[in-house]
Amino acid sequence: EVEKTACPSGKKAREIDESLIFYKKWELEACVDAALLATQMDRVNAIPFTYEQLDVLKHKLDELYPQGYPESVIQHLGYLFLKMSPEDIRKWNVTSLETLKALLEVNKGHEMSPQVATLIDRFVKGRGQLDKDTLDTLTAFYPGYLCSLSPEELSSVPPSSIWAVRPQDLDTCDPRQLDVLYPKARLAFQNMNGSEYFVKIQSFLGGAPTEDLKALSQQNVSMDLATFMKLRTDAVLPLTVAEVQKLLGPHVEGLKAEERHRPVRDWILRQRQDDLDTLGLGLQG
């Protein structure tokens, strides 16, 4: 807290400009009107304030808006956003995607901080669902964002938003998350033809049931081993040797390199040796 002191004569700020960088902390507190600061927040980022000076500016805004900042101020916070705590952010009502983008830009290149996580949570909850534009924005800044959500949170993603998801966005998803996303993807891509459908659905197949894998095996899809390794164990185990051979096509030879890893190991163990021998790969059940 900065002690309340009268502003020295002639130092009262008429606008937010570079002259303020020479003000001591107590002078900023005494001479900068909080309402002026709020209306000229867009200028703050262009001025090289010290961290200590930014603390004073934040304090002034906190006093002016004890219930939380209005979006007109939030959108122009810039680097002052880095001074906010999750508790501060929980008071906000952020509805504009432009505001979200502006604040994510401040944190760009860094890990998702607790502040950013809180901001995103507030924004998504305010919207009621993860629409395509929001998902586009979030995954652009944080490719792992989708996989950081719980299965319950993912259930609010409408199938239409799935079009925004890139394969790399799903890299760190676990089976429970893919179980939620796969049916949405299936619905989103249902009107595509065979080969185009497979290209789109491929990254979601970690949530596919056995019957869908059996159906794909009839379509000459040539699934790569990396995709096969991400399939659900319970979906893979009932597949016959013939079905796996059709599903993988020329990639079936890759099973040998993965024979000690799940789910390949578990699948091999449950096949008849005679059937495995038809692959000519030397797999031992």
């Epitope: 676990d174 164990t233 890893h261 190991r265 031992q284």
Partner: antibody, heavy 119, light 107 residues
């Protein structure tokens, strides 16, 4: 529900073969989803997986013990067994049998049996 | 073979504390990591499988997270019955390795 019970001698002489049996009750050793493992724990130390068997007879052993380990299954008796040859004092441990459910992990364990290797 | 390194090897905590145990795999085990609790003189008990799935009958204060090489077991509010040794284990690679264990003691 499924229960496991280890049995076998508690004292084995150095260079001899340690033999233990695990009896499965309340379920079948011929389950499609499960493999059956042996795991050991030397006094005051951590857990070491020894190996598993599937009801078909397929096995998988810890590479560090592979040359000395044999695990077998008797589906008619609903049992599986461990043989560890050429034992030394370093093989003194509590030996556990456990069910490894393919979808979860070692979800059911025997209570463990202490085996001491000493002359 | 995949090696599993647990940290810390021991920790002291009080009832009500949030406790975090980490496990690092020497190479990716994807999401295939299980967590077990063992009390003195007893067999281990499965808590978490597939990195984050809670085993049936296990209290919800236990949670797991992680994928690839870094995994975490969290006890949100430590209870008297939680003082025990915890082990991670990877079933991804056929070597089925366990971590060295983390002993959670009363402060």
């Amino acid at each position: 529900q499924v229960q496991l019970q280890e049995s076998g001698p508690g004292l084995v002489k150095p260079s001899e073969t340690l033999s233990l049996t695990c009896t499965v009750s309340g379920g079948s050793v011929s389950s499609f989803t499960d493999t059956w493992s042996w795991i050991r724990q030397p006094p005051g130390k951590g857990l070491e997986w020894i190996g598993y068997i599937y009801y078909s007879g397929s096995t998988n052993y810890n590479p560090s013990l592979k040359s000395r380990v044999t695990i077998s299954v008797d589906t008619s008796k609903n049992q599986f067994s461990l043989k560890l040859s050429s034992v030394t004092a370093a093989d003194t441990a509590v030996y556990y049998c456990a069910r490894d459910n393919v979808f979860t992990g070692f979800d059911i364990w025997g209570q463990g049996t202490m085996v001491t290797v000493s002359s | 073979d995949i090696q599993m390194t647990q940290s810390p090897s021991s920790l002291s905590a009080s009832v009500g504390d949030r406790v975090t145990i980490t496990c690092r795999a020497s190479q990716s085990s994807r999401y295939y990591v299980n967590w077990y609790q063992q009390k003195p003189g007893k067999a281990p008990k499965l808590l978490i499988y597939a990195a984050s799935s809670l085993q049936s009958g296990v209290p919800s204060r236990f949670s797991g997270s992680g994928s690839g090489t870094d995994f975490t077991l969290t006890i949100s509010s430590l209870q008297p019955e939680d003082f025990a040794t915890y082990y991670c284990q990877q079933p991804y690679d056929a070597s089925y390795t366990f971590g060295g264990g983390t002993k959670v003691e009363i402060k």
